[in-house]
């Protein structure tokens, strides 16, 4: 058994080596974004990633080309919920230093939950998306 | 070397099918998202189909649906398309292509081609 | 499916000019998934530029590539005699991966 786990931790790591999580960070990205838009953020405000989305992608064009590749990329996972998780942690690893406040965090955490679900997917059991301070990006 | 080698091609009449292979070597094939892209004569490039790392996901441009169908064997480092009730409209080279991204920022895109096989399809 | 209109059809120009070849799509585009690529004749596609603006390895830095949503632009600053070719932008964001129809750079 205890081989089995270290084969499947293996596979696992090497199919999140070749996976792009871009697109689903970009995507969840946009969703926060646009909720903020309509409470009155500026929606013109800087950012430092060059695929962050435009004002004009924000209000929903090109969105879902983000979520299609998304969803494909997580499909991936689809057989091994351990390794979905993982993918869900370091989407959320990879995004935590992005996140304003404590509010946007929150709101992020909720729609990286929803994400395989939103992909027609298993969303995996108990995954803790919980970043430690000061996370640093694994991609 | 990295190198994608598309054979199967060939004259077959209208309604009639072709099985196209593309044999990949140089890189570790089950790590890529694979396409198939043709090109009629005189024409320009037109997307057919795409399949992704594990087959779990997989596209076809709607001119093609429900009668070409895409596939891998990962262990034999092999792409595959089956071509069913060919029409005239089918004349074109066949590319093979791999599809990577950029790591840091998320872009795909195809950087891997073969050199193409033709199919011809005439009475 | 998304529709990419390229422009002009033919580029009749000689070398050491400047060469600004058009792209447009029926629906907004992520600048993540707009890609040109550089066909010569009897050849398979070359990739160019990859997520609108970055070049691909070995890509000279006379080529250049910008826009975002529906408009998005190749540039190649000072022709050389290998530029002339035909060139395609492609959208892989949304199945259909589309492909524009393409523009013949020729030497006038």
């Known amino acids: 058994r205890q081989q089995w786990e270290l084969q499947g931790d293996r596979r696992c790591q090497s199919q999140l080596e070749r996976a792009n999580l871009r697109p689903c960070e970009q995507h969840l990205m946009q969703k926060i974004q646009r909720d903020e838009d309509s409470y009155g953020r500026d929606p013109y405000s800087p950012s430092q990633d060059p695929y962050s989305p435009s004002p004009y992608d924000r209000r929903g064009a090109g969105s879902s080309q983000h979520q299609e590749r998304c969803c494909n990329e997580l499909n991936e996972f689809e057989n091994n919920q351990r390794c979905m998780c993982e993918a869900l942690q370091q989407i959320m690893e990879n995004q935590s230093d992005r996140l304003q406040g404590r509010q946007q965090e929150q709101q992020f955490k909720r729609e990286l939950r929803n994400l395989p679900q939103q992909c027609g997917l298993r969303a995996p059991q108990r995954c803790d998306l919980e970043v430690e301070s000061g996370g640093r990006d694994r991609y | 070397e990295v190198q994608l080698v598309e054979s199967g091609g060939g004259l077959v009449q209208p309604g009639g099918s072709l099985r196209l292979s593309c044999a990949a070597s140089?890189?570790?094939?089950?790590?890529?998202?694979m396409n198939w892209v043709r090109q009629a004569p005189g024409k320009g490039l037109e997307w057919v189909s795409s399949?992704?790392?594990?087959?779990?996901?997989?596209y076809y441009a709607d001119s093609v649906k429900g009668r070409f169908t895409i596939s891998r064997d990962n262990a034999k480092n092999s792409l595959y398309l089956q071509m069913n009730s060919l029409r005239d409209e089918d004349t074109a080279v066949y590319y093979c292509?791999?599809?990577?991204?950029?790591?840091?920022?998320?872009?795909?895109?195809?950087?891997?081609w073969g050199k193409g096989t033709t199919v011809t399809v005439s009475s | 499916e998304i529709v990419l209109t390229q422009s002009p059809g033919t580029l009749s120009l000689s070398p050491g000019e400047r060469a600004t070849l058009s792209c447009r799509a029926s629906?907004?585009?992520?600048?993540?998934?707009l890609v040109w690529y550089q066909q010569k004749p009897g050849q398979a596609p070359r990739l160019l530029m990859y997520?609108?603006?970055t070049r691909a390895t070995g890509i000279p830095d006379r080529f250049s590539g910008s826009g975002s949503g529906t408009d998005f632009t190749l540039t190649i600053s000072r022709l050389e005699p290998e530029d002339f070719a035909v060139y395609y932008c492609?959208?892989?964001?949304?199945?259909?991966?589309?492909f524009g129809q393409g523009t013949k750079l020729e030497i006038k």
């Open positions: 292509a791999r599809e990577d991204f950029d790591v840091s920022t998320g872009p795909y895109y195809m950087d891997v």
């Open positions: 140089g890189f570790i094939f089950s790590d890529y998202n």
């Open positions: 399949i992704t790392r594990s087959s779990r996901t997989i």
């Open positions: 629906q907004s585009v992520s600048n993540m998934f």
């Open positions: 997520g609108a603006s």
């Open positions: 492609q959208q892989n964001g949304n199945s259909p991966y589309t």
